[in-house]
């Protein structure tokens, strides 16, 4: 019976985050909906996942692992593309595949260290080891040497017995409020907040009626809005305050006029 | 019902090696549904978790730090049963030893234990 | 290592009187679908342990229903809707979110 490598995770006690928020802890909101996020844990310095409420919360909420990795972790978009080129690949990446104790049928992807590819394999859910990525791009943008891998990734077709795992609420429910328009409307690239701050407000998927607040980037301003109680999207406050401290801070205006704060 | 049944010496000599058994029955040590481990217990450190061992394509084991230059677990498929090896004992690792079946399907937990064994290490 | 920290070591209960148990974990413990990598067991005198809840949430089979489990995050609690007698003896909780598996030092609980 050999012994599996062990997790190679390097010391980082004295690693300051990129961000105040990032210190936060991971904070699921009052709210009843499953929205799978990813927050950034400062005792392990890594992002993990969590299940988020809807509502509420905390800025240490991404949608996205990727997200939550260049925002919170210094030199990750550096070590990224450190490892794309083929300097170096962190030890994870030679570890090899671990489903883990449980048996919860995630789709992940492993660096093979044969192969010199990332590859899909199912992962149980818990207790797995570090070579075990979200998304192909992932595993190549952090193991994967792109001098090894002009032919396609082969995957095993597996979706007849692996299912996703994500207990996702549906977003795809037609928003009912009606956002005025201004002539005055940031274009994208100038808001640096919040991405969720950019989203319709959404009342979601239930039948309550509660008082919440959306950030509106069109005005720069929170808007109330009635909430249903679940689903919908993270553009949702419980007061006007908690949103504008949320998203205020991220519209940037012209260069000229200075940033509003 | 799954039963875990330990067996060993309750008495081991300092610098000796702990041998411990754990023979299963309703439940097969090659389960891909299943995890086999070893706790143990004592007044001074509570319940410890030592390693674990699971078959799925292949067999992998995990131990903790705090033992793993010592600890060896093995499945033995002849006979469904595993055993937990220690090497170097010290009265340090006086305590009881429990085998446990980890459920990989629906618990997530330890669902069933064997009855603990005390071992004493003692000249 | 996570280090899971309970409190009270021990409590002293009342039949009948509610009970409450709190386990906090050194990081955050991970929640995939909606469940929390902890459990929670009880080792009756003379006994082995048994588990109790899993999941953070889910009462294991047998497991009456005046026992429940909550929380998220670093923060967990077992509560104990009315205290029987057969309810006596040593409660951990637990974590699986990473290696070492690790276990709270156990909460005492006794009648009064």
């Known amino acids: 019976l050999s012994e599996e490598a062990d997790d190679t995770d390097s010391e980082l006690g004295s690693m300051k985050p990129l961000h105040t928020f990032c210190a936060m802890k991971a904070d699921d909101g009052p709210c009843k909906a499953m929205i799978r996020s990813y927050f950034f844990n400062m005792y392990t310095h890594q992002c993990e996942e969590f299940i988020y409420g809807g509502c509420e919360g905390n800025e240490n909420r991404f949608d996205t692992l990727e997200e939550c990795k260049k925002t919170c972790i210094p030199g990750y978009e550096k070590t990224a593309v450190k490892a794309a080129s083929g300097a170096e690949r962190p030890d994870f990446c030679f570890l090899e595949e671990d489903p883990g104790l449980c048996r919860g049928y995630m789709k992940r992807y492993l660096y093979n260290n044969q192969t010199k590819q990332c590859e899909r394999f199912v992962y149980g859910g818990c207790l797995g080891n570090r070579n075990n990525f979200e998304t192909l791009d992932e595993c190549k943008k952090i193991c994967e040497n792109p001098v090894h891998s002009p032919s396609p990734v082969n995957e095993v077709q597996m979706s007849d017995y692996v299912t996703d795992g994500n207990t996702v609420t549906d977003r795809s429910t037609v928003n009912n409020i009606v956002v005025p328009q201004s002539p005055k409307v940031p274009r994208r690239r100038d808001y640096r907040g919040r991405p969720w701050c950019l989203q319709p407000a959404d009342s979601g998927l239930c039948k309550a009626s509660e008082r919440r607040f959306y950030y509106n980037s069109a005005t720069g301003k929170c808007h109330r809005f009635n909430y249903t109680g679940c689903g919908g999207n993270n553009n949702n406050f419980t007061t006007r305050r908690r949103c504008l401290r949320s998203c205020k801070t991220g519209l940037i205006k012209n260069k000229s006029k200075g940033v509003v704060k | 019902q799954v039963q875990l049944q330990q067996s060993g010496p309750g008495l081991v000599k300092p610098s000796q090696t702990l041998s411990l058994t754990c023979a299963i029955s309703?439940?097969?040590?090659?389960?891909?549904?299943?995890?086999w481990s070893w706790i143990r217990q004592s007044p001074g450190r509570g319940l410890e978790w030592l390693g674990i061992?699971?078959?799925?394509?292949?067999?992998?084991?995990r131990y903790a730090v705090s033992v793993k230059s010592r600890i060896t677990i093995n499945p033995d498929t002849s006979k469904n049963q595993f055993s937990l090896q220690l090497n170097s004992v010290t009265p340090e690792d006086t305590a009881v030893y429990y085998c446990a079946r980890w459920d990989s399907d629906k618990h997530w937990g330890f669902d069933y234990w064997g009855q603990g064994t005390l071992v004493t290490v003692s000249s | 290592d996570i280090v899971m920290t309970q409190s009270p070591l021990s409590l002293p209960v009342t039949p009948g009187e509610p009970a409450s148990i709190s386990c906090r974990s050194s990081?955050?413990?991970?929640?995939?679908?909606?469940?929390?990598?902890l459990n929670w067991y009880l080792q009756k005198p003379g006994q082995s342990p048994q588990l109790l809840i899993y999941?953070?949430?889910n009462r294991a089979s047998g497991v009456p229903d005046r026992f429940s489990g909550s929380g998220s995050g670093t923060d967990f609690t077992l509560k104990i809707s009315r205290v029987e007698a057969e309810d006596v003896g040593v409660y951990y909780c637990?974590?699986?979110?990473?290696?070492?598996?690790?276990f709270g030092q156990g909460t005492k609980v006794e009648i009064k």
């Open positions: 637990q974590q699986y979110d990473s290696y070492p598996l690790t």
């Open positions: 309703g439940d097969s040590v090659s389960s891909d549904s299943a995890a």
């Open positions: 999941k953070g949430s």
């Open positions: 061992i699971y078959k799925r394509s292949k067999w992998y084991n």
């Open positions: 990081q955050s413990l991970v929640i995939s679908r909606g469940n929390t990598y």
